[in-house]
């Protein structure tokens, strides 16, 4: 029943509903999930909030809430409403929030919405709306937020939106929209957020976003776009852009030339093969750029003006060289992943003072010079596996005080410089068949995990049996891209940090160290006692 509170207010609390003052001499009334089939009758004229969601109300009569002139929020979500008559909201002069989601409406209730001049938020999502009449929002001059997602729209209701010049956020996601015409949102100059994800959009008018001068977030994820959405070029305030999970094959030159404020771009799960060299220029706010498998890229991108990039991943392309000035453009880079390319020669990375992780595995690198990795004081992880490295300058790693992980497996090394590597916790040298010398454990006091070409080389680390072996010990996080983690997410800008996984593994290995000083593989055993004697 009514909350046992005294005062005139609570006399207007319907049976079984929960009522409480809102702090302004008005009443909040919660009648949700009570199995009601009609609206309660004895509501206080001083009601400011009325929740009737999750009931069985199938119809509203004209003027069902007379005299609720102070009502600011009305929730009718999760009922069985198929139609809302003219006059249903008559007299609700203060109404700011109207929730009609999860009903069975087939079109926007134009007449019922007329003259709700104070309305700021309108939820019509999760209905069966296939038609939005041209004038249905014409009286809603204060509307700020509009939800039309999860309906049956097949086209943008262009004319209906023309009257919503104050609108700030709108979602049309989860519909069946196939095309966005020119000037579809031409009068929405205050719109900041626009969600169009999970539609069937295959084409965009060249000027479809013209007029959206305040837009900061645009979500085109999970559509059928075949071409890069060049129409974004007029969105000068755009900060977050998503067009992942489409069918886009190339990103053109100057792709984001009109979007200098971009902070985040999600474009994974597209069959991108080619990216214009100038595509990502002049994006000073961009922090992360990830592009996997663009096999037609042969040149490193020109990132002039994108100086705040912290993470650059450009894998599976055909880049054969890096400009000598690469770090001049990217002074803030912390993570560089250029694995699975055709790199032969490396520039000096010493200007990239903030680099913490470099991944250059699966390239064609044949030599590491003295200046390649000089003075990278923050570098923690360096992966050079699966290259053709035969020569490493004796002092190549001498000024890397933070380096704890080094992977040189599957190269052509016959010797290995130890200078500067005393802080290593992980060292991988397996697959260097010409590397037959013993490495002293004294040079690596912090070592936890080491992988050597031959079993006998593990004897130096006191490993004489394979007591605690974990398969694929090295860097488990590296093989599954962050893109995979995003695939299931229809939401737009979820962020996950792969470093969490690495830290977990490091902690796990720390526990192992307490049991066993160094984990070395391949572990010597009765069938692998002296492989070096049998070689050659």
């Amino acid at each position: 029943g009514s909350s046992p509170r005294s005062g005139v207010l609570l006399r207007g609390c319907p049976t079984h509903c929960h009522c409480e003052p809102d702090g302004r001499m008005l009443l909040r009334v919660d009648c949700s999930d009570l199995g009601l089939s009609e609206l309660p009758s004895n509501l206080s004229v001083f009601t400011s909030y009325l929740d009737l969601s999750m009931n069985n109300i199938s119809q509203l009569l004209p003027n069902p809430l007379p005299s609720l002139r102070f009502l600011e929020e009305l929730r009718l979500a999760g009922n069985a409403l198929t139609y809302i008559p003219k006059g249903a909201f008559t007299g609700l002069y203060s109404l700011k929030v109207l929730m009609l989601q999860n009903n069975q409406l087939r079109h926007v209730p134009t007449e019922a919405l007329q003259n709700l001049r104070s309305l700021q938020s309108l939820r019509l999502d999760a209905n069966h709306i296939s038609y939005v009449p041209p004038s249905c929002f014409s009286g809603l001059h204060s509307l700020r937020h509009l939800w039309l997602d999860d309906n049956a729209l097949t086209e943008i209701p262009v004319q209906a939106f023309r009257s919503l010049s104050a609108l700030q956020a709108m979602t049309l996601a989860l519909n069946k929209i196939h095309h966005i015409p020119d000037y579809a949102f031409g009068n929405l100059s205050s719109l900041v957020v626009l969600h169009l994800h999970n539609n069937r959009i295959h084409s965009l008018g060249k000027k479809c976003f013209d007029g959206l001068h305040s837009l900061e977030t645009l979500d085109l994820n999970y559509n059928n776009l075949d071409e890069f959405p060049t129409a974004i070029r007029t969105l000068s305030n755009l900060k977050e852009l998503g067009f992942h999970s489409n069918n886009i094959r190339s990103i053109p030159e100057k792709a984001f030339v009109g979007n200098p404020s971009l902070i985040t771009i999600h474009f994974y799960d597209n069959p991108i093969q080619f990216v214009g060299r100038s595509a990502f220029q002049h994006l000073p706010e961009l922090r992360t750029l990830t592009l996997n498998g663009a096999s037609q890229i042969t040149e490193f991108p020109d990132l002039t003006g994108t100086a705040n990039l912290e993470s650059l991943t450009l894998t599976g392309a055909q880049i054969s060289s890096l400009p000598q000035t690469v770090c001049n453009q990217l002074p803030n880079l912390q993570v560089l992943d250029l694995s699975y390319n055709l790199l032969e020669d490396l520039p000096s990375f010493s200007v990239c003072q903030k680099l913490q992780k470099i991944d250059l595995r699966h390239n064609e690198i044949y030599e590491i010079k003295v200046d390649t990795f000089q003075q990278l004081l923050s570098l923690r992880s360096l992966n050079l596996a699966w290259n053709k490295i035969a020569i490493i300058h004796p002092n190549a790693f001498s000024t890397l005080p933070s380096l704890i992980k080094l992977d040189l497996s599957s190269n052509l090394l016959s010797s290995f410089p130890i200078t500067g590597l005393h802080g290593l916790t992980h060292l991988k040298l397996t697959g260097n068949h010409a590397l037959q010398s013993l490495i002293s454990s004294e040079n690596f006091p912090e070592l936890k995990v080491i992988e050597m070409p031959y079993a006998y080389q593990c004897c130096a680390f006191g490993v004489c049996e394979n007591a605690y072996k974990i398969s694929n010990q090295w860097n488990k996080g590296d093989n599954s891209s962050m893109d995979d983690l995003h695939k299931k997410d229809a939401g737009m800008f979820q962020a996950q940090d792969e470093r969490d996984l690495e830290d977990f593994l490091l902690d796990f290995e720390e526990d192992l160290k307490a049991l066993h000083s160094v984990q070395c593989s391949p572990s010597p055993g009765p069938f692998k006692p002296c492989e070096h004697l049998l070689d050659g």
Partner: antibody
Amino acid sequence: EVQLVQSGAEVKKPGASVKVSCKASGYTFSAYWIEWVRQAPGQGLEWIGEILPGSDSTDYNEKFKVRATFTSDTSTSTVYLELSSLRSEDTAVYYCARGGHYGSLDYWGQGTLVTVSS
Amino acid sequence: DIVMTQSPDSLAVSLGERATINCRASESVDNYGNSFMHWYQQKPGQPPKLLIYLASNLESGVPDRFSGSGSGTDFTLTISSLQAEDVAVYYCQQNYEDPFTFGQGTKVEIK
């Protein structure tokens, strides 16, 4: 205040080229299309084409496609129209205008008179 | 190309009287409920000035004696009460499809 300021009048010989500039101010340069329109003496208005400054996005009236070239310089917020192989019938006032609400031309330059005469 | 035909070519109206200019497009310029038709005023020695966009929307700063109507192929610009400063040439323009085209102009004078 939005302004489009065009370069001064030009006199050219037939077969020559002319380059007209249009300097924009008072708004975000790259967010609006710039249209080029010409008006022969005593005649009506004729659309030449459009460019989205900073990008390579251009559209030309088929009639001018071979002879007209639009370029832009974002550092100076300036758009250029170059018209080559001039003939006497190209004598006109050339206007730049901003494509505003729904592509309507809401701000115009003052015009540049190009006279082609031998 | 879409051909825009204005009528009449010239119009003389007394001060304070109504002036009506018509514009017909050779094909519809409507798209998704919007009519991509605009009206401009040009005075001698000046560039054109936008009056009406999308057939019926008054541009900011334009006196409300100017109004536009129509859809599809037939459009009208009305000056409800002609003032001396309204003497000019008036142009309609479509930007429904390339190339964008203008009417030939209607000259409005005082009778």
